[in-house]
Interface confidence: medium
């Protein structure tokens, strides 16, 4: 079996001019392509992998929501030579939240890593964005986490930072087929420079107060201090599945339309996030795809 092969990390790694073919090992009988797009209220980026796969032919599309961070995943496996170029890796430039200028800042600032490399997303070096409230949701928390896509024996990962709806989530995550989006939330401007070691204790839990020992000359204090030994109370996760994005038309004859970009174009969005789901920004492409090797 021969499959297309590429890796895209918020760049043009799977753009037409960089397409490779690879012969699969004996016993490997499916080609795979997986696309994962992450959308914050300040932009979106994607990861994609094509190559020799494992398992059965089929499709698996899913949408996920992690505290207002939206993720769209498409996985496609097929059993014909070079059949794994059916997902359209084109995206339109995202107009965040429909029109970001229509939303006044809510006073919170967060570090933003949207398609940045791990090196560019270290500490306080990423750009700072002003949070705003959209779609009747309050985005006053900052997030620091990672998105990981695994397919075709390849794992690609990128950092994610930005404004979210939760200020206290700790090591929360959502998963899809070969996909994970996880991280922690925090309260306060620019608090998300590094939440990798965030513990489960949050500002919502009163601190344990150590009282001075009672003085022997006084009567024992009647003040009682209650400490909770139960697990930290955190708001219920807003994680929920979303309608799956629709897949692209399989590529066909060369005489048809060309389409490609540095990030996957995914149709549909999160229910309840119409303002920023881009449901109208990722129209299904008219006409079959162009089977060409780009860059030549």
């Amino acid at each position: 079996l021969e499959c297309y092969s590429c890796v895209q990390k918020a760049d043009d790694g799977c753009s037409p001019n960089k397409m490779k073919t690879v012969k699969c090992a004996p016993g490997v009988d499916v080609c795979t392509e997986a696309v994962g797009a992450v959308e914050t209220i300040h932009g979106q980026f994607s990861l994609a992998v094509r190559g020799c796969g494992s398992g059965l032919p089929g499709k698996n599309d899913r949408g996920l929501d992690l505290h207002g961070l939206l993720a769209f995943i498409q996985l496609q496996q097929c059993a014909q030579d070079r059949c794994n170029a059916k997902l359209n890796l084109t995206s339109r430039a995202l107009d965040p939240a429909g029109n970001e200028s229509a939303y006044p800042p809510n006073g919170v600032e967060c570090y933003s890593c949207v398609g940045l490399s791990r090196e560019a997303c270290q500490g306080t070096s990423p750009p700072v964005v002003s949070c705003y409230n959209a779609s009747d949701h309050v985005y006053k928390g900052c997030f620091d986490g990672n998105v990981t896509l695994t397919a075709a024996n390849v794992t690609v990962s990128l950092p994610v930072r930005g404004c979210v709806q939760d200020e206290f989530c700790t090591r929360d995550g959502v998963t899809g087929p070969g996909f994970t989006l996880s991280g922690s939330c925090c309260q306060g401007s620019r608090c998300n420079s590094d939440l990798r070691n965030k513990t489960y204790f949050s500002p919502r839990i009163p601190p344990l107060v150590r009282l001075p020992p009672p003085e022997p000359t006084t009567v024992a204090s009647t003040t009682s201090v209650t400490t909770s030994t139960s697990a930290p109370v955190r708001p219920t996760s807003t994680t929920k599945p979303m309608p799956a994005p629709t897949s692209q038309t399989p590529r066909q004859g060369v005489e048809h339309e060309a389409s490609r970009d540095e990030e996957p174009r995914l149709t549909g969005g999160a229910a309840g996030h119409q303002d920023r789901s881009n449901s109208g920004q990722y129209p299904a492409k008219g006409g079959p795809q162009q089977p060409h090797n780009k860059g030549c």
């Epitope: 001019n17 060309a258 389409s259 490609r260 006409g287 795809q289 860059g295 030549c296």
Partner: antibody
Framework: EVQLLESGGGLVQPGGSLRLSCAAS????????MSWVRQAPGKGLEWVSY????????YYADSVKGRFTISRDNSKNTLYLQMNSLRAEDTAVYYC??????????WGQGTLVTVTS | QSVLTQPPSASGTPGQRVTISCSGS?????????VHWYQQLPGTAPKLLIY???QRPSGVPDRFSGSKSGTSASLAISGLRSEDEADYYC???????????FGGGTKLTVL
């Protein structure tokens, strides 16, 4: 039918500037990567630059990097190539080409740029 | 000098089979990048002839075929016709140059 029509070529002195345009029709321009490819008189093809469908990614051949700028206006279905600090070796027919899923599947008829003193 | 190496000329008589080679390196064809072939008739713009190593766009006769092996690719034209007289270019992406590269072109003459 797909059509690509280049314009803007002409005679220019070394060090001068020129802006090429490519008017596209017959396909969804905003979904297509586009390229400029040139061909010096009597010579072979040389890729110059390409731009992603949204315009957010641009790439250049080393020979033109820092001097040429590719851009696009998807609302006008037009691709551009701004050429500055032109040299005699930039003399060529410049083709606008659409990139299909992988290859350059449609080409314009070309516009001649002549750089001479 | 072109990154992809083609013979400058090739010739054949009508009905013959002609093969044009395209030699690359580990940073382009050998890296697994797909190869395309373009035909440029005299005085016209290039036209896509073969894409994705061996695929023909609709409208291209099955007399034209492409193949790829290792760091090389080849274009075969069977049942040669006078209208096949043209320049033929191979192309592929190149890692080291971060862009598409073309062969120097092969001028095919039908005797």
């Amino acid at each position: 039918e797909v059509q690509l029509l280049e314009s803007g070529g002409g005679l220019v002195q070394p060090g001068g500037s020129l802006r090429l345009s490519c008017a596209a029709s017959g396909f969804t321009f905003s979904s297509a990567w586009m390229s400029w490819v040139r061909q010096a008189p009597g010579k072979g093809l040389e890729w110059v630059s390409y731009i992603s469908s949204s315009g957010s990614s641009t790439y250049y051949a080393d020979s033109v990097k820092g001097r040429f700028t590719i851009s696009r206006d998807n609302s006008k279905n037009t691709l551009y190539l701004q050429m500055n600090s032109l040299r005699a070796e930039d003399t060529a027919v410049y083709y606008c080409a659409r990139e299909g899923l992988w290859a350059f599947d449609w080409w314009g008829q070309g516009t001649l740029v002549t750089v001479t003193s | 000098q072109s990154v992809l190496t083609q013979p400058p000329s090739a010739s054949g008589t009508p009905g013959q089979r002609v093969t044009i080679s395209c030699s690359g390196s580990s940073s382009n064809i050998g890296a697994g990048y797909v190869v395309h072939w373009y035909q440029q008739l005299p005085g016209t713009a290039p036209k896509l002839l073969i894409y994705d190593n061996n695929q023909r766009p609709s409208g291209v006769p099955d007399r034209f075929s492409g193949s790829k092996s290792g760091t090389s690719a080849s274009l075969a034209i069977s049942g040669l016709r006078s209208e096949d007289e043209a320049d033929y270019y191979c192309a592929a992406y190149d890692d080291s140059l971060s862009g598409p590269v073309f062969g120097g072109g092969t001028k095919l003459t039908v005797l």
